[in-house]
Structure formats: structure tokens, C-alpha cells
Interface confidence: low
């Protein structure tokens, strides 16, 4: 039977196949792929803008970070404030004061602990 | 678009500041902003870049210690040197990468400034 | 690392012909390339990210190809407009690395 480079095409993910010869293709991948029939997830991770210990998770032609608990925003710099997240932070009167990264509590009455509780 | 500033003519051993300024957009978008220099008649020699989302810097490893990119506001950032050399002599250019996941794809350039050491 | 090799250092080719330009890194860069291309008294003018990416407004001339050591930068149908600087650049790591951009090379039109 006739070889026809196109048909059915060898791109994968998308790719658009282009015959150049009789017996050869060109795959024109999409942003975000690569290899000669467009089979690789480009990894965009290098260089990530991820901070305060935020993890870079690939994805097509784009990636993600993942924050940890006190980080939030796209790149994880945006202090997450606790203190409107968890209301009853501070026990016994505390009062709760957000920090980067973290929050405290401010202690009344003879209590201490992180927590105002002891 | 950006503009260098600072530039001229500077005796060896001597500090200089570049500065350059923005406008159309601001950092806080999440670009790279990095500086690249040009000897005259040469190629293009890469000094460094400040990720502008968090102050994180990267240098040549020729660059550390002598030359300290930092962001001064959302639309500026600057080029500390110092001991200057008359090997420092060179054009020197700012360059707005895409931002996110064009990291360190200079999309945007200024004019450039011209930095001359001599005596 | 991540040292980038460009040749030729210049070429000279005929108004519709075509030229291929080469670059070679020392470390595996997967697919971060730029090409750029560079006139005299002009800053660099980006044509090819991410390796085969052609930038906005570039003509569809210029073809960028190769991935993890070996890249390409090819012009086909050379017109007088392209006589310039061409120059790789690597974007896959700033730590360690003494230039991101290649040694350049030069297009003379004959």
C-alpha cells in the first residue's frame, strides 16, 4: 500500500502534520509541546518565579505554584492572613496580629503561650 | 517601552548607577528585569536579572560582587558599580523579559546608555 | 555551564538564498532559546523563543529548530533587510553562568 506521511498524522497533542517529501513529515507542534511528533509536555518549571517555598508544578505551557499554608498568589508572596482564616487563633482575650509568613498573638491578662492558652 | 539613564564618562576605579525606567507597565505584572551590555564592536555580554515579584537576583558569575541590580520602585530598576575598569566600557541595556513562563525572553529592550571609563 | 557556542563567527550569502546559523550548548538546555537578531546602534530585537516560537511580527523566513544541545536558526529567501548580528541566547539557567547569549554572528548580504 502507498506510504502517505500525513495519513493518519503522527503529531500527537495537537500537532498539525506538513508532508515534506515522499516519505517524510513535519509535525508544528502547539505552544507547549515539543519532539518530532510533538509526544513531549514542554517542562516550564526552569526559572520559575515560585517563592517563600513554593513548589513549581508543570503544566501545557504553563505552570503552577504550590504554596505552602502561609503563602498564597500566583507565585506564593502574598502573606495569607490567619488571622481572619482561623477567628479563635488567640484563646483568652488574645489578640491575633498577622505576620509575614505566620501571625502571633498578643497575650492579656497573665496568659502566654503561643496560643494565649497557658 | 524602558530608558536607560546614568550613563557617560567615568574615571577608572570610579562607581557609577544606571537607572531604568518604565513606562507602560509595571512590575508588578511579574516580569524579569535584567541588564546586558555591549563593548564596542562585541557581542552581547549578560550582567544580571532581578525576578521583580520577589527581589530574587541572579548574576554572572563575572558580575557578583562588583555589580548589584536592584528594583528602586514599580517602574525602576537599577545597576550598581563599582571599580570601574576600562574594561567596563560598553553600551548597557535594559530588557523586560515576557513575564511567567516566557522567563528571560527579552520581548522588550531600551536604547541603551553608553558607559566610557577612561582618563 | 551552560556555555553557548554559535557558528559561523560570519557569513555572507546572495539576496534569496538561504542561511543556517548554529548554536551549541555545553549542558542540556531542553528547548530555552531565544534568537535574536541585532542591527548596528540598535538594542536586540527578539525573533525565536522557546527554541522554534517565532516572536511577534517576525517574518515566517526565519525558522528556529534543535533541542537540547544542538540549535538552528535558518533564513530562508535572504532579503537585504537581514543583514545583521544573530545571536542565541539560553534561558534555561542564570546560576553558574558566565554569558547567556552565544559569541554571535554576522550576515552580510552580497
Known amino acids: 500500500s502507498l506510504y502517505v506521511p500525513c495519513a493518519p498524522s503522527p503529531c500527537v497533542n495537537g500537532g498539525t502534520c506538513r508532508q515534506t517529501g515522499d516519505f517524510t513529515f513535519e509535525c508544528n507542534c502547539l505552544p507547549g509541546f515539543e519532539g518530532s511528533t510533538c509526544e513531549r509536555n514542554i517542562d516550564d518549571c526552569p526559572n520559575h518565579r515560585c517563592q517563600n517555598g513554593g513548589v513549581c508544578v508543570d503544566g501545557v505551557n504553563t505552570y503552577n505554584c504550590r504554596c505552602p499554608p502561609q503563602w498564597t498568589g500566583q507565585f506564593c508572596t502574598e502573606d495569607v492572613d490567619e488571622c481572619l482564616l482561623q477567628p479563635n487563633a488567640c484563646q483568652n482575650g488574645g489578640t491575633c496580629a498577622n505576620r509575614n509568613g505566620g501571625y502571633g498573638c498578643v497575650c492579656v491578662n497573665g496568659w502566654s503561650g503561643d496560643d494565649c492558652s497557658e | 517601552s524602558l530608558e536607560e539613564s546614568g550613563g557617560g564618562l567615568v574615571q577608572p576605579g570610579a562607581s557609577l548607577t544606571l537607572t531604568c525606567t518604565a513606562s507602560?507597565?509595571?512590575?508588578?505584572?511579574?516580569?524579569?528585569m535584567c541588564w546586558v551590555r555591549q563593548a564596542p564592536g562585541k557581542g552581547l555580554e549578560w550582567i544580571a536579572c532581578?525576578?521583580?515579584?520577589?527581589?530574587?537576583t541572579y548574576y554572572a558569575s563575572w558580575a557578583k560582587g562588583r555589580f548589584t541590580i536592584s528594583k528602586t520602585s514599580s517602574t525602576t530598576v537599577t545597576l550598581q558599580m563599582t571599580s570601574l575598569t576600562a574594561a567596563d566600557t560598553a553600551t548597557y541595556f535594559c530588557?523586560?523579559?515576557?513575564?511567567?513562563?516566557?522567563?528571560?525572553?527579552?520581548?522588550?529592550w531600551g536604547p541603551g546608555t553608553l558607559v566610557t571609563v577612561s582618563s | 555551564a551552560y556555555d553557548m557556542t554559535q557558528t559561523p563567527a560570519s557569513v555572507e550569502v546572495a539576496v534569496g538564498g538561504t542561511v543556517t546559523i548554529k548554536c551549541q550548548a555545553s549542558?542540556?538546555?531542553?528547548?530555552?532559546l531565544a534568537w535574536y537578531q541585532q542591527k548596528p546602534g540598535q538594542p536586540p530585537k527578539l525573533l525565536i523563543y522557546?527554541?522554534?516560537t517565532l516572536a511577534s511580527g517576525v517574518p515566517s523566513r526565519f525558522k528556529g529548530s534543535g533541542s537540547g544541545t544542538e540549535f538552528t536558526l535558518t533564513i530562508s529567501g535572504v532579503q537585504c533587510d537581514d543583514a545583521a548580528t544573530y545571536y542565541c541566547?539560553?534561558?534555561?539557567?542564570?546560576?553558574?553562568?558566565?554569558?547567556?547569549f552565544g559569541g554571535g554572528t554576522k550576515v552580510e548580504i552580497k
Open positions: 530588557a523586560r523579559d515576557g513575564g511567567f513562563t516566557d522567563t528571560w525572553y527579552f520581548h522588550l
Open positions: 507602560g507597565f509595571s512590575f508588578s505584572s511579574g516580569y524579569d
Open positions: 532581578i525576578v521583580t515579584v520577589s527581589g530574587n
Open positions: 549542558e542540556s538546555i531542553g528547548s530555552y
Open positions: 522557546r527554541a522554534s
Open positions: 541566547q539560553q534561558t534555561y539557567s542564570g546560576a553558574g553562568v558566565d554569558n547567556l
